[in-house]
Amino acid sequence: EGAAQSNNSLMLQTSKENHTLASNSLCMDEKQITQNHSKVLAEVNISWPVQMARNAVLCCPPIEFRNLIVITWEIILRGQPSCTKSYRKETNETKETNCTDERITWVSTPDQNSDLQIHPVAITHDGYYRCIMATPDGNFHRGYHLQVLVTPEVTLFESRNRTAVCKAVAGKPAAQISWIPAGDCAPTEQEYWGNGTVTVKSTCHWEGHNVSTVTCHVSHLTGNKSLYIELLPVPGAKKSAKLY
């Protein structure tokens, strides 16, 4: 996950700023197709965080169709047998083995487009996807470690006198919580759910009279969110003394 964050920081920044985008694609423009096969002989593996409920398009190496013999997509999802989708150009045949998820399909017919689409992305789509293109010159690979991101639900409330609780519920990966101003905070609690999401809870207390409003800032790969709350008075306090 760490690698995914650093390798894709630019893309993640873009996705934060363009929340309206319904699909994600790492596919290359046709103009970028490599004529010289030696440039792409090495296997390429891409770590790719994709937000849940979006559409994702995964691409094969940029090999010209006339050079193709077979295209194979290998899909390895957690706790499931490996699924393969293949297309043989000579016979114009497609074949599937152990593929049960109807949301994972060819973008169109493989003779037109070798890309794979996930429509829409679900939390169960975490896994490894690899396109293998067999040509007379050898096999060309492109692999994707797909990390499905789930936006946490953020809540903030005052549990008791001048103690606030901020929760980032069911996020993937775990969100990070910070406070303005800094308070006297208990260790952050994390609750792991069976589907791979995590609930993070931070509880903090502010003793000083002069703290009026506290802000909980939740940082997450899908975007950041802040909530704030005006604290109740210090118990028993009627009038402020010279506080400042």
Epitope: H209, N210, S212, T213, E230, L232, K238, S240
Partner: antibody, heavy 114, light 107 residues
């Protein structure tokens, strides 16, 4: 939707006191801080203090300490701001607000003139 | 007290231009803030809450950014009805403190 209805304009002599009211509706009166802000003619906004009607807890800005009194009447969902020992520089529009500044009254013009 | 330094104090801009106003909190103390618009004879109107959240019904040409001690308010394409005075307000600490205001005039 929160609504804050303030009392009408006042004209006072220097040295007198003024009491401005602000009646709240549309939210749980005892659960939210109520704030007072003033604005002298052609000047910026100045926070005076706040009151928590649920407990009567108050904070006053140091500048007004000793001259300002904020109170709340929970039976009528009304807060009051009384400013004493008035001087000409207290001529201003006085606003009540709540919800960290999301809802404001229309303001009450207090003119201090001899 | 936290002092809020707002700049510029005034500016004259043409319709369609981009406008940027900044607010900085003193003492290096992280705070949260709102941005208000005030027209003559009216109460201030909240435009941006919590530094960057556009209030309901406020046109999308208004935006806010920043965190900690430095904040920016932007009007992407100035409209004639945007002529007003704009204020920031820090509401993290008592006493709450406003910026000095920025008077925005249309050229």
């Amino acid at each position: 939707e929160v609504q804050l209805v303030q009392s009408g304009a006042e004209v006072k002599k220097p040295g007198a006191s003024v009491k401005v009211s602000c009646k709240a509706s549309g939210h749980t009166f005892t659960s939210y801080w109520m704030h007072w802000v003033r604005q002298a003619p052609g000047q910026g906004l100045e926070w005076m203090g706040n009151i928590y009607p649920g407990s009567g807890s108050i904070n006053y800005d140091e500048k007004f300490q000793g001259r300002v009194t904020m109170t709340a009447d929970t039976s009528t969902s009304t807060v009051y701001m009384e400013l004493s020992s008035l001087r000409s520089e207290d001529t201003a529009v006085y606003y009540c607000l709540t919800g960290t500044g999301t809802s404001w009254g229309r303001g009450t013009l207090v003119t201090v003139s001899s | 007290d936290i002092q809020m330094t707002q700049s510029p104090s005034s500016l004259s801009v043409s319709v369609g231009d981009r406008v940027t106003i900044t607010c900085q909190a003193s003492q290096g103390t992280p705070i949260n803030l709102h941005w208000f618009q005030q027209k003559p004879g009216k109460a201030p109107k909240l435009l941006i809450s919590g530094a960057s959240n556009l209030e309901s019904g406020v046109p999308s040409r208004f935006s806010g950014s920043g965190s900690g001690t430095e904040f920016t308010f932007t009007i992407s394409s100035l409209q004639p009805e945007d002529a007003a005075t704009y204020y920031c307000l820090q509401f993290t600490y008592i006493p709450w403190t406003f910026g000095q205001g920025t008077k925005l005039e249309i050229k």
